[in-house]
Amino acid sequence: TEVKVTQPEKSVSVAAGDSTILNCTVTSLLPVGPIRWYRGVGQSRLLIYSFTGEHFPRIRNVSDTTKRNNMDFSIRISNVTPEDAGTYYCVKFQRGSSEPDTEIQSGGGTEVYVLAK
């Protein structure tokens, strides 16, 4: 059965300077491959976070993703700024065989509104 990526919130509002959680769960970890968060769509989309060990300032995972059966790939963004506004997508990839990873499923997106403090 095909993996499903669920982002339960269509939108979230957060005051500038505060933190927000963007929720994402998957129904399967197979086929193997990373899960990444992007802001925007298409060629101009921006990588926000990748669950592949790198450090991303102001962003961290919510659950213990070192659990081998973890299906929760939610993230917390701290000290939100107006520049963080936009639609965020949680994307499941299949690892590439000597070629780039292939996107196989995306969540529906969560729009982040940043309110003035």
């Epitope: 197979l30 086929p31 193997v32 990373p34 592949t52 070192t66 659990k67 081998r68 690892r95 000597s98």
Partner: antibody, heavy 118, light 108 residues
């Protein structure tokens, strides 16, 4: 620099128990999953146990499940392996290893030798 | 018995290219790594996530995959590369870490 130092090995008799320790430094221990791997004399590598960063989830191959127990104390940056009912087949060098994001191993300790002999 | 299959030995002359293969895992559920072990020493990670090389590993070591077979390639083999090489995997379907039986690389 990442450092993993195993201790607790030695000579034990068949049927006895032993607890190995692995002291970690040079990285945020509480953020990484860890594993134990052993190597019998003249043989290949065998994965024995894995544990999540928080310590709540543990994983074993069928060959040692129920006899070996992996645990960790994040306040002490230390990983443990409790081994019960040891037999001569458990004679090996035991290594602790840090896991990558996808549960492969990037850093290894120098190992500690366990000899089970009557 | 080992879940992953490697040739027991590979021989190569200095300066030549050595290739060590590993098979047996399902491509959709496995990640692979390669570990080098010299006599009396602990293993050292050469390649992880199929083809990623730690920063301290020389560029002559590379990993690739094709279907259910992964390959460790050592270009311009040097005498110091003589060692045992282990293929290791992570199987997401069983949460286990199988190894191959190891390949002894002899530099002629």
């Amino acid at each position: 620099d990442v450092q993993l130092v195993e201790s607790g090995g030695g000579v034990v008799r068949p049927g006895e128990s032993l607890r190995l320790s692995c002291a970690a430094s040079g990285f945020t221990f509480s953020s990484n999953a860890m594993s134990w791997v052993r190597q019998a004399p003249g043989k290949g590598l065998e994965w024995l146990a894995g544990i999540s960063a928080g310590g709540s989830d543990t994983y074993y191959p069928a060959s040692v499940k129920g006899r070996f127990t992996i645990s960790r104390d994040n306040s002490k940056n230390t990983l443990y392996l409790q081994m019960n009912t040891l037999t001569a087949e458990d004679t090996a060098v035991y290594y602790c290893a840090r896991e990558t994001w996808n549960h492969l191993f990037d850093y290894w300790g120098l190992g500690t030798l366990v000899t089970v002999s009557s | 018995s080992y879940e992953l299959t490697q040739p027991p030995s590979v021989s190569v002359s200095p300066g030549q290219t050595a290739r060590i293969t590993c098979s047996g895992g399902s491509y959709s559920s496995y990640y692979y790594a390669w570990y080098q072990q010299k006599p009396g020493q602990a293993p050292v990670t050469l390649i992880y996530s199929d083809d990623k090389r730690p920063s301290n590993i020389p560029e002559r070591f590379s990993g690739s995959s094709s279907g259910t077979t992964v390959t460790l390639t050592i270009s311009g083999v040097q005498a110091e590369d003589e060692a045992d090489y282990y293929c290791g995997g992570y199987d997401q379907s069983s949460y286990t870490n199988p190894f191959g039986g190891g390949t002894k690389l002899t530099v002629l």
